[in-house]
Interface confidence: low
Amino acid sequence: FNISGCSTKKLLWAYSTRSEEEFILFCDLPEPQKSHFCHRSQLSPTQVPDHLPFTDSKDLPDVQWYRQPSNGDPLEDIRKSYPHIIQDKCTLRFLTPGVNNTGSYICRPKMIKSPYDVACCVKMILEVKPQSNASCENSASHKQDLLLGSTGSISCPSLSCQSDAQSPEVTWYKNGKLLSMTRSNRIVVDEVYIYHQGTYVCDYTQSDTASSWTVRAVVQVRTIVGDTKLKPDILDPVESTLEVELGKPLTISCKARFGFERVFNPVMKWYIKDADLEWEVSVPEAKSIKSTLKDEIIERNIILEKVTQRDLRRTFVCFVQNSIGNTTQSVQLKEKRGSGGLNDIFEAQKIEWHETVRFQSHHHHHH
């Protein structure tokens, strides 16, 4: 289709080489309430249309995105050629930065309902470049945290080194919706609620003698609870003794709840005490089985191929730790009465003899 009639917008993405960040393009078609898509008579190619906060309504249009190759080749369908660019309804999401994202991106409605709609399209000329190292060291992150229940602010990364007085007028979007209440380089939140979480976009205009560009940055905002003041608690095992059958396999699960910490380095391990010896056991990796706003439950299992007589004299200890402190839970194995016949006992003794030899050659004091 002919893109000469598309309205045009120039955008600049100055990405930080120090951190991961995303970028978003909106398909700024005019609101369907004002016109059916965009009748050419109502929108000249130079006009920048009102931004449409697209929702999931079935009544609103899906759009198709294309990239225009610089060599004049035909338009490329983004879904086929660029796996790191995600088309989500009326936004285009760039998952990774890089100058190779520089180019022209065109969007238009998938459904063309009248001859006037053919020229209904927006062309976005995107220039991508790494931020100069001269930029200030304390520039705002593209991932920002807000503490639930407290006052907080969201800063525009590309302007965070400038004072509020110096800062140009900023346009903010939240979830693709225009935020009209602020024009500052930061949004002040009087009280943080969970719905403040999400994707924010800040735009400002940068002009030189030749042309005018919209400088855009994307901020992922997370609402968090305060760091826990508690050490982790062990949810399982609850009992300090466990009835087992000799010669049978056994899995003991340790589950612990860790309170939220911004810098989260949980420790969870099993070790065994046997008389005056103590050693850490090689067990499968710990896994997170439940993650909520306030805490995370982590599980790690110790697996015994066959329970031996020696295991009955040992103590199995689950040890968990966060930055506040540690917690342990000990488990002693106890033979189930009347669980097996003579064969089971002989088998268990044979296993124990092999295990004793292996134990003596492999284990030493745990420091």
């Epitope: 693709g176 609620y193 969970i194 719905y195 999400g198 439940k290 909520t292």
Partner: antibody
Framework: QVQLQQSGPGLVKPSETLSLTCTVS????????WTWIRQPPGKGLEWIGY???????NYNPSLKSRVTISVDTSKNQFSLKLSSVTAADTAVYYC?????????????????WGQGTTVTVSS | AIQLTQSPSSLSASVGDRVTITCRAS??????LAWYQQKPGKAPKLLIY???NWESGVPSRFSGSGSGTDFTLTISSLQPEDFATYYC?????????FGQGTKVEIK
Amino acid sequence: QVQLQQSGPGLVKPSETLSLTCTVSGGSISNYYWTWIRQPPGKGLEWIGYISDSGSTNYNPSLKSRVTISVDTSKNQFSLKLSSVTAADTAVYYCARETIVVRGFYFYVMDVWGQGTTVTVSS
Amino acid sequence: AIQLTQSPSSLSASVGDRVTITCRASQGISSALAWYQQKPGKAPKLLIYDASNWESGVPSRFSGSGSGTDFTLTISSLQPEDFATYYCQQFNSYPWTFGQGTKVEIK
């Protein structure tokens, strides 16, 4: 398609405990909040409270002393108990799923509702 | 608790009319407001969340607007199936509260 099926007695005697159960079908009970709401005859809606899949609860302060909401993830069910009922507790009781919708952002919505159970408190 | 006051309590309108219902919060709730439609003997149905976002499948004749304390639900062209009671609900702070409802009747 997630559906909520309510069950429980339609008639409860004063001072007794009202018990209702909501069974979730066509989807998991995990990763959502599960809510109870009531509507007295000819009146508006009143939020009773919620329970998360992990068992954390939040109740309306006006009912807190009498309400217990519990969850049984193995049965995909959650339940409401309201003790010491009076005629003022006569209402249609609804269970609902409270979702945190992610559209690049978080919003709470009550997007799936049970059919409602009419509970009359009378001797 | 945050109180929500809807106005009017009831209104009579004809098919094709533009209908506006307002909801006022006793304190600022940002955009944390939802609108529901309820028909007699049925459970409420979500129409709008976050003050202005359509729930999936809701016709575009329903629209929501507002922020802070004043919110509006507009039905641009009333259809026969739109005669019902409409409730607003805040999701800003616990306990969640509802408006008293606005009944839209056939003129």
